[in-house]
């Protein structure tokens, strides 16, 4: 059947930044300026993404592809496709409604963009905080109390080697 | 799948209170600002607070400013509404809606919303 | 506050005809900040469009929106039967409440 149908539609043929003119008799045009059809058989192209505004073009629109969009400096992209530019903010802060607000205390933010995390609980792994977290950076944690205690050794056996990107097994 | 359920709701009389919940799964509740929304019986929508990922910023409509509070807590996957002082014109449904992007705290549309409660405040 | 204000209240059209909705905000919003979304009966709002013209997931082809500045627009290409509902604008713009459209009816005719 699908066979039948692509010898019966002209449109099938097509090809990709063209499409099929119904006013020209079913005959494949090129795509007009600033739009385009990336599969073939369509019967209209669709209008090429216009970076404007804090957007900026990281790829221009072709007959086969549409633009691809990024932002402008101080903003960065969020969602699929860049779809909206969220304004920076430093180190140790983050977008809210109100503007940028500096992380609270016991979270961090070691970007300029996205938000403000809790410090790891090194006590959860059993071990101790060597080094304060700060509103940029997170807390550095070190061995646990017990491994300081005198007499005992700080050096942990080395764990086994493991090559990177595999899962043990 | 995405799902938020919120529970909690009920009949309470004017200056009581009530605590409402939104339990979520189906995706990484920390990374998302969340929202409460409500809608009076055959009326429209009305945004009432959100809170940032781990809950450093709030924001409140001002018609609850100071009678309600939002929380979460993101080992539970669950958010919270404190109704305090409760009004007569609270009487909603209230929803709990999922923040459009992820990993921003900055308060943006929803694109996930559960199915809803009912507040009735009434004597 | 933004207030936010749709036309019409109330549109009759029949199946297969346009709808065209309109949003007008009391200040200039960034394009980036508008959203509509669908609600019917006994339902959750939908998210249709966000970013004035980015169609959500899953959202047909035939909902469309446009517009910058005080002036919004979706536009139904098509009516189906299950498009018939309320449909809402909201404003998520910078230091500003979120606020909702008071809503706009599209009936059967």
């Known amino acids: 059947f699908e066979r039948t149908r692509s010898l019966q539609d002209p449109c099938s043929n097509c090809p990709a930044g063209t499409f099929c003119d119904n006013n020209r008799n079913q005959i494949c045009s090129p795509c007009p300026p600033n739009s385009f059809s990336s599969a073939g058989g369509q019967r209209t192209c669709d209008i090429c993404r216009q970076c404007k505004g804090v957007f900026r073009t990281r790829k221009e629109c072709s007959s086969t592809s549409n633009a691809e969009c990024d932002c402008t400096p101080g903003f960065h992209c969020l969602g699929a496709g860049c779809s909206m530019c969220e304004q920076d903010c430093k180190q140790g802060q983050e977008l809210t409604k109100k503007g940028c607000k500096d992380c609270c205390f016991g979270t961090f933010n070691d970007q300029k963009r996205g938000i403000c995390r809790p410090w790891t609980n090194c006590s959860l792994d059993g071990k101790s905080v060597l080094v304060n977290g700060t509103k940029e950076r997170d807390v550095v944690c070190g061995p646990s109390p017990a491994d300081l205690s005198p007499g005992a050794s700080s050096v942990t056996p080395p764990a086994p080697a493991r090559e990177p990107g595999h899962s043990p097994q | 799948e995405v799902q938020l359920l919120e529970s909690g709701g009920g009949l309470v009389q004017p200056g009581g209170s009530l605590r409402l919940s939104c339990a979520a799964s189906g995706f990484t509740f920390s990374a998302y600002n969340i929202h409460w929304v409500r809608q009076a019986p055959g009326k429209g929508l009305e945004w009432v607070s959100d809170?940032?990922?781990?809950?450093?910023?709030?924001n409140y409509a001002d018609s609850v400013k100071g009678r309600f509070t939002i929380s979460r807590d993101n080992s539970k996957n669950t958010l919270y509404l404190q109704m305090n002082s409760l009004r007569a014109e609270d009487t909603a449904v209230y929803y709990c809606a999922r923040n459009l992007y992820e990993l921003s705290a900055y308060s943006y549309g929803a694109d996930y919303w559960g199915q809803g409660t009912l507040v009735t405040v009434s004597s | 506050e933004i207030v936010l204000t749709q036309s019409p209240g109330t549109l009759s059209l029949s199946p297969g005809e346009r709808a065209t909705l309109s949003c007008r905000a009391s200040q200039s919003v960034s394009s980036s900040y508008l959203a509509w979304y669908q609600q019917k009966p006994g339902q959750a709002p939908r998210l249709l469009i966000y970013?004035?013209?980015s169609r959500a997931t899953g959202i047909p082809d035939r909902f469309s929106g446009s517009g910058s500045g005080t002036d919004f627009t979706l536009t139904i290409s098509r009516l189906e039967p299950e498009d018939f509902a309320v449909y809402y604008c909201q404003q998520y713009y910078y230091s500003s409440p979120i606020t909702f459209g008071q809503g706009t009816k599209v009936e059967i005719k």
């Open positions: 970013g004035a013209s």
């Open positions: 809170i940032s990922p781990y809950g450093g910023a709030t």
